[in-house]
């Protein structure tokens, strides 16, 4: 198959909604950047549809995306990261819809990892620490983190704390005693770059101590 639509297909195609969204990840694999796009309507027939990016590239005018099931993906060193690129949905040589986007404004950081919680008995608090690959990066270094925690039995009652460092102290008196808590963290660009929240880190689970009756404090 050539990938070109028949005339009838093209006419049908023009009736469809080809709106799409994209996010970039800078230095996601060494010095390689990635760009991921997907249609907003999951029911779009993507059989003959391709994505292409042109402009603000190094040593090439345009690049084609690879199709990975429902998403379209590029990993390359060739993003100039200056100025807007034109991202188009195409059938053959015909562009169905295009967006001009600066890839530094649609950055989705990598998810934080190594989340852990340590109880400090003497201080009566919990020290939350996590790691992010962005500390080692040249570009998207400065992030805002969103730490969310909840008592495991409270399905949707998350408490959120925003912070710019990778360490947070939770006071013991603010938590329920003898309870199981779930905690997770995500990140968003906070300086120069714009974009979206990362995926959540894997959750970490910890239990708060019992109340010590003599002192009114937790064990």
């Amino acid at each position: 198959e050539s990938g070109y639509a028949q005339n009838g297909d093209l006419e049908d195609a023009e009736l469809d909604d080809y709106s799409f969204s994209c996010y970039s990840q800078l230095e996601v694999n060494g010095s390689q950047h990635s760009l991921t796009c997907a249609f907003e309507d999951p029911d779009v027939n993507i059989t003959n549809l391709e994505f292409e990016i042109c402009g603000a590239l190094v040593e090439v005018k345009c690049l084609n995306f690879r199709k990975l099931q429902e998403i379209y993906f590029i990993e390359t060193k060739k993003f100039l990261l200056i100025g807007k690129s034109n991202i188009c949905v195409k059938v053959g040589e015909k562009s169905l819809t295009c967006k001009k986007i600066d890839l530094t404004t649609i950055v989705k950081p990598e998810a934080p990892f190594d989340l852990s919680v340590v109880y400090r008995e003497g201080a009566n608090d919990f020290v939350v620490t996590f790691n992010t690959s962005h500390l080692q990066k040249k570009y998207v270094k400065v992030l805002m983190h969103d730490v969310a925690y909840r008592q495991e039995k409270d399905e949707n009652k998350w408490t959120h704390v925003n912070l710019s460092s990778t360490k947070l102290t939770l006071l013991q008196r603010k938590l329920q005693p003898a309870a199981m808590y779930e905690i997770k963290v995500r990140s968003i660009p906070d300086h120069y770059f714009k974009g979206f929240w990362s995926e959540w880190s894997p959750s970490y689970y910890f239990r708060t101590p019992e109340i010590n009756n003599s002192s009114g404090e937790m064990d």
Epitope: L57, E59, V60, K61, L81, I82, G83, K84, T104
Partner: antibody, heavy 117, light 110 residues
Framework: EVQLVESGGGLVKPGGSLRLSCAAS????????MHWVRQAPGKGLEWVSL????????YYADSVKGRFTISRDNAKNSLYLQMNSLRAEDTAVYYC??????????WGQGTLVTVSS | NFMLTQPHSVSESPGKTVTISCTRS????????VQWYQQRPGSSPTTVIY?????PSGVPDRFSGSIDSSSNSASLTISGLKTEDEADYYC?????????FGGGTKLTVL
């Protein structure tokens, strides 16, 4: 209507400094890549520097690297070029240009910098 | 680093067609877009062609741009020449983040 108005040019002695400004209006300044381009009297265009929409990315021609600094203030819709250690060969009309969706759609009227003792 | 070489001057009569070439010294002309600027005497440059062959709104369709891989060059063609087309014309491309300009071509409409 898009407008770019340069100012700050003038006569300066070799080794001296000048700060050029470019006031922008009529477009979304804070998502536009901005450039400085210069033109020596009777000569062609020479690219000087560029700055990304956010000020993070800055690049310079080899001829000015280490002497000139490009910056922007998005709150004031303004572009700047701090020029230090000026030389006679820096004498030129300096244009600010908006890249927008493509380079040079809009240029200012230019400001003349003369470096002479 | 590459250079863009243009003829120093060209001249032609009103109503005729003129082509200005812009040859890239190394690397492929296909590897980055070419823009063309017009600069009338005493004025700022204005874009007449961007991204090889695209015309900004307001630029007459007498102006066209093209790329020729075999000669590693870009061309600006102006048909139906008018006296107001008399100006300097510059090509421009990209070397990574740096902008590279051709030396300019003076077009005289006889």
């Amino acid at each position: 209507e898009v407008q770019l108005v340069e100012s700050g040019g003038g006569l300066v002695k070799p080794g001296g400094s000048l700060r050029l400004s470019c006031a922008a209006s009529g477009f979304t300044f804070d998502d536009s890549v901005m450039h400085w381009v210069r033109q020596a009297p009777g000569k062609g265009l020479e690219w000087v520097s560029l700055v990304g929409w956010d000020g993070f990315f800055t690049y310079y021609a080899d001829s000015v690297k280490g002497r000139f600094t490009i910056s922007r203030d998005n709150a004031k819709n303004s572009l700047y070029l701090q020029m230090n250690s000026l030389r006679a060969e820096d004498t030129a009309v300096y244009y600010c240009a908006r890249q927008g969706d493509y380079m040079g759609n809009n240029w200012g009227q230019g400001t003349l910098v003369t470096v002479s003792s | 680093n590459f250079m863009l070489t243009q003829p120093h001057s060209v001249s032609e009569s009103p109503g005729k067609t003129v082509t200005i070439s812009c040859t890239r010294s190394s690397g492929s002309i296909d590897s980055s877009y070419v823009q063309w600027y017009q600069q009338r005497p005493g004025s700022s440059p204005t874009t007449v062609i961007y991204e090889d062959d695209q015309r900004p709104s307001g630029v007459p369709d007498r102006f066209s741009g093209s790329i020729d891989s075999s000669s590693n060059s870009a061309s600006l063609t102006i048909s139906g020449l008018k006296t107001e087309d008399e100006a300097d014309y510059y090509c421009q491309s990209y070397d990574f983040h740096h902008l590279v300009f051709g030396g300019g071509t003076k077009l005289t409409v006889l």
